[in-house]
Amino acid sequence: APVRSLNCTLRDSQQKSLVMSGPYELKALHLQGQDMEQQVVFSMSFVQGEESNDKIPVALGLKEKNLYLSCVLKDDKPTLQLESVDPKNYPKKKMEKRFVFNKIEINNKLEFESAQFPNWYISTSQAENMPVFLGGTKGGQDITDFTMQFVSS
């Protein structure tokens, strides 16, 4: 059976939107009006992995692009990147672990924990126009809470 996917955008708890920053990075900033068209649309695929009521494994691809968020070690540190894939083979139900995030819902907010690196989360900074990154702390000054907005296909 084909993998189930939905299109969505994400905003952090400060209402910053996510946009492309160069070819292989995302950044977070406040957008208004026409500029909202800049925000990236994700194709969120529901993939194989450990699942519970509030924790669902997903892969986050960029809609109509062969790019997926992935978590890899760089200089011995878990790092978030956008990785190119062969569009003939992706998305798939059994995604490599580096592409998998545990989507965790808490109080109507979403967290995205790396499956490859437990307790590391997709994060943004308080500051405007700065990269989205993989952070190893929750509840500090970096933001790990997001809301999801559905986008029609």
């Epitope: 920053s21 994060s123 900074s125 500051a127 405007e128 126009n129 952070g135 190893g136 000054q141 970096d142």
Partner: antibody, heavy 118, light 107 residues
């Protein structure tokens, strides 16, 4: 008054190491991104590295990647740049700068000169 | 990486002149552009951020315009203290990059 004071520069042989420090005062250091920017003698400005307030997010120029490490100690209001495997082309005045809105450098230190020569 | 090209690289002008410096980005950087002034032996000083916003304490004779790929810094009525080197810098994406600089000399 915002003040940034770099130290740790000097003469070092190729292949050697140095650690630069930048002491910050006059603002809440722990809330700001910080940059290192360098300027070779008689040349233009080159961005070197950035670190987020928490220290969790860092980025580097390709020219220093794998050799330089940016870090900070928020309890000491101090920014660092560990420079290893230094080359002649790393010779420059190194500035630390506070990051303002959207990624500009709104306050700069006076700079510290690093000379790599045998 | 985004390349920033400044022109002219140097210019001679007189006190009271109106001067325009151009900065071009190799790709769209929206309005994420800053301008700096540097005098010999000193650190750069932020003049303009977000392409058009005057930094606090900077005289109103400095102004910035542009968005996308083409930007200008204008100095209305040059003053003696304005003879310096000016740099643009894009903040759209890492690695951040600077223009090569424009040296403004006294004619």
């Amino acid at each position: 008054e915002v003040q940034l004071l770099e130290s740790g520069g000097g003469l070092v042989q190729p292949g050697g190491s140095l650690r630069l420090s930048c002491a910050a005062s006059g603002f809440t250091f722990s809330k700001y991104f910080m940059f290192w920017v360098r300027q070779a003698p008689g040349k233009g400005l080159e961005w070197v590295s950035v670190i987020s307030p928490s220290g969790q997010m860092t980025r580097y120029a390709d020219s220093v990647k794998g050799r330089f490490t940016i870090s900070r100690d928020n309890s000491k209001n101090t920014l660092y740049l560990q420079m290893n495997s230094l080359r002649a082309e790393d010779t420059a005045v190194y500035y630390c700068a506070r990051v303002g809105y959207g990624g500009n450098s709104d306050y700069w230190g006076q700079g510290t000169l690093v000379t790599v020569s045998s | 990486d985004i390349q920033m090209t400044q022109s002219p690289s140097s210019v001679s002008a007189s006190v009271g002149d109106r001067l325009t410096i151009i900065c071009r980005a190799s790709q769209d950087i929206n309005r994420w552009l800053a301008w700096y002034q540097q005098t010999p032996g000193n650190a750069p000083k932020l003049l303009i951020h977000s392409a058009t916003s005057l930094q606090s304490g900077v005289p109103s004779r400095f102004s910035g315009s542009g968005s996308g790929t083409d930007f200008t810094l204008t100095i209305n009525s040059l003053q003696p203290e304005d003879f310096a080197t000016y740099y643009c810098q894009q903040a759209d994406s890492f690695p951040l990059t600077f223009g090569g600089g424009t040296k403004v000399e006294i004619k």
